[in-house]
Interface confidence: medium
């Protein structure tokens, strides 16, 4: 008796974070025995779409010509072989940016920081939001995701980083969002260049994701602080 069919691989090109109006292609890669591919979207009637495999039959393409709110969400795909349907793929989260006006990102006390000292990145939105994300250019994932606990909305969120090393240097952007859809984000803020000057020899480098924040978890979230009420936003790694 053969075991369950291996799960397919699901990905998006050019990526899983897409600006409003831009095109995106979702790929599902299974095996050469695949006869049909199915794409399911969470909270939508299944199947969301079906496609015949492209030669040599080990993958299928699902095209979204123009990204809108309706396409944002969590997807899984399956393939059918002569012996039945595969296990579901790992989920793909397709996020749309441009749903809200862009926030402002600033650095306190300054974007020019000496190694070994501290800095706070402040993301401010014009209207109250309950989710804020901080993104570092060329990082594989969002660095920090601040989300309101009780739906309490804020105009800003603080991302403290301490102690700063060369790892923290680079270009940051932030997004804001409403909790009712984590897949709809604002336009990105203008980029903020964080420049770290070295007064001490840099400690051994850690991965880009290991940006230490506020001295407590190095690469895991902390309570946002300062102007954000204690009962408000909490940090989550995504």
């Amino acid at each position: 008796q053969a075991g369950p069919l291996p799960k397919p691989t699901l990905w998006a090109e050019p990526g899983s974070v897409i600006s409003w109006g831009n095109s995106v292609t979702i790929w599902c890669q299974g095996t050469l025995e695949a006869r049909e591919y199915r794409l399911d979207k969470e909270e939508s009637p299944a199947p969301w779409d079906r496609q015949n495999p492209l030669e040599p039959k080990n993958k299928a393409r699902f095209s979204i010509p123009s990204m809108t709110e309706d396409y944002a969400g969590r997807y899984r795909c399956y393939y059918r072989s002569p012996v039945g349907w595969s296990q579901p793929s790992d989920p793909l989260e397709l996020v749309m940016t441009g749903a809200y006006s862009k926030p402002t990102l600033s650095a306190l006390p300054s974007p020019l920081v000496t190694s070994g000292k501290s800095v706070t990145l402040l993301c401010q939105s014009r209207s109250p939001m309950d989710t804020f994300l901080l993104i570092k250019e060329r990082a594989a994932h969002p660095l920090l995701h601040l989300r309101s606990e009780h739906g309490a909305q804020q105009h800003q969120a603080e991302f403290p980083m301490s102690p700063v090393t060369s790892v923290h240097g680079g270009t940051y952007r932030c997004f804001s969002s409403h909790g009712f859809s984590h897949y709809l984000l604002s336009h990105p803020s203008d980029p903020l260049e964080l420049i770290v000057s070295g007064s001490l020899e840099d400690p051994r480098p850690s991965p880009t994701r290991s940006v230490s924040t506020a001295a407590g978890p190095e690469d895991q979230p902390l309570m946002p602080t300062g102007s954000v009420p204690h009962s408000g936003l909490r940090r989550h790694w995504e």
Epitope: T120, P160, P163, R204, G216, P217, E218, Q220
Partner: antibody, heavy 117, light 110 residues
Framework: EQSVESGGDLVKPEGSLTLTCTVS?????????ICWVRQAPGKGLEWIGC???????TYYGSWAKGRFTISKTSSTTVTLQMTSLTAADTATYFC???????????WGPGTLVTISS | ELDMTQTPASVSEPVGGTVTIKCQAS??????LAWYQQKPGQRPKLLIY???TLESGVPSRFSGSGSGTEFTLTISNLECADAATYYC????????????FGGGTEVVVK
């Protein structure tokens, strides 16, 4: 979540001692700043230094550099190695975990180190 | 070197009164400042971080203010349980420091 210090002892001057901080309720599979703070009898708090359990980066107070070494020894333990001890190093040593704005929310009960001949 | 200076060293106030403790940094620490309470024989307890954010479970009688080099911890409507030593601590600079903590202020409640 808690941290507990161990290894406190009576040591002769110029001797060495290693203290261990053992955490429970969390582990260093997520990266934390674990720091050591000491308090001499009847005196104030003194920051010794910290280690990032993910990166291995260490920071020390200027007076502690060279004589004190903080290391991560397992997914739940951090040590503080102390050398060339003098009577001035007599203190309760606390292991703490970093929190928001580099504050210390989680403190161990402390372990007493006495340096005397 | 960045140093933290706390004043006064000791203060005595009656129950119901108000105590103000000051902490001065020798150079700016932005708002990277925390306050702790320590009672004899006990470990310190975090009260305030980020200069003004009250730690969960801490009574609102405690408040923190300030930014840069000057910080204040205020305890209003003093209770007997507030008798303790209070410390400030900067978290801004990890590199060139002798001690991150201030020298402490003993609060006596009459």
């Amino acid at each position: 979540e808690q941290s507990v210090e161990s290894g406190g002892d009576l040591v002769k001057p110029e001797g060495s001692l290693t203290l261990t901080c053992t955490v429970s309720g969390f582990s260093f599979s997520s990266s934390y700043w674990i720091c050591w703070v000491r308090q001499a009898p009847g005196k104030g708090l003194e920051w010794i230094g910290c280690i990032g359990t993910g990166s291995g980066s260490t920071y020390y107070g200027s007076w502690a550099k060279g004589r004190f070494t903080i290391s991560k020894t397992s997914s739940t333990t951090v040590t503080l190695q102390m050398t060339s001890l003098t009577a001035a190093d007599t203190a309760t040593y606390f292991c703490v975990r970093g929190a928001g704005y580099s504050s210390y929310r989680l403190w161990g009960p402390g372990t007493l180190v006495t340096i005397s001949s | 070197e960045l140093d933290m200076t706390q004043t006064p060293a000791s203060v005595s106030e009656p129950v119901g009164g108000t105590v103000t403790i000051k902490c001065q940094a020798s150079e700016s620490v932005s708002n990277w400042l925390a306050w702790y309470q320590q009672k004899p024989g006990q470990r310190p307890k975090l009260l305030i971080y980020g200069a003004s954010t009250l730690e969960s479970g801490v009574p609102s009688r405690f408040s923190g203010s300030g930014s840069g080099t000057e910080f204040t911890l205020t305890i209003s409507n003093l209770e007997c349980a507030d008798a303790a030593t209070y410390y400030c601590q900067q978290g801004y600079d990890w590199d060139n420091i002798d001690n991150a903590f201030g020298g402490g202020t003993e609060v006596v409640v009459k």
